[in-house]
Amino acid sequence: SEAEDASLLSFMQGYMKHATKTAKDALSSVQESQVAQQARGWVTDGFSSLKDYWSTVKDKFSEFWDLDPEVRPTSAVAA
């Protein structure tokens, strides 16, 4: 359903936001060497790309309404 889809997207966005902050905090405590700067840039870009990837891939996964029903129809009550 749309609610489930929105919930899943929200979860992923929240997860990525938390992961980005954690990675940035860890890197900011590292000495500002050229390597550290490059690493921080890579992580920032990487999570930004992951966010973009999720927003596109979300449309490719089958939505929940088009997956397997909980009960096979042959065991359901006749209409």
Partner: antibody, heavy 114, light 112 residues
Amino acid sequence: QLQLVESGGGLVQPGGSLRLSCAASGFTFGTYSMRWVRQVPRKALEWVSSISTDGGGTAYRDSVKGRFTISRDNAKNTLYLQMNNLKPEDTAIYYCVIAGYSDWGQGTQVTVSS
Amino acid sequence: DVVLTQTPGSLSVVPGESASISCKAGQNLVHPDGKTYLYWLLQKPGQSPQRLIYQVSNRDSGVPDRFTGSGSGTDFTLKISGVKVEDAGVYYCAQGTYWPKTFGQGTKLEIK
């Protein structure tokens, strides 16, 4: 017992239209998402379209988007596929299928040729 | 689109022997809900396809236990132990994890 019976197929010229129907019985039709799947002459199976239980959600393969419309009437236990601007490559046997591929109709032949 | 590659394209088996069909997916078939929507279907001559296995390894009711589905991620297998004459037909794997939903090209099982 459960039955899915397709109808509405036939021979049509390119650019023409057809409306396929699938009469469902033997189960609570309104509680199951449905699909149309076709089998082209070389025997390959292709998913065509899906529709949610209330008809609010629909999905189509790219090659039929804008030409085909899936719909359902839960009061009549019937699934539909309106096919417009038909092309020779739409020639196939069209099957009505319950989501998850658990049950299939016998199929209806659609031939698009001049 | 997720390509499903089945091998072999055809096989001929003596009744009583085992048969194995492979299905390789171009992408990991695990859905965000944690389930893997990989199916095995059989189409007997002149009939509509029928589902044998759903979600990789679950046999449909009425399907003999000689049919076994296994695998994960991108590699899946259908094994038929002690093949019977009535098992002849074309076997398809199918995925429902992604749109568009796709099918393998089929494996024709012939009984010698």
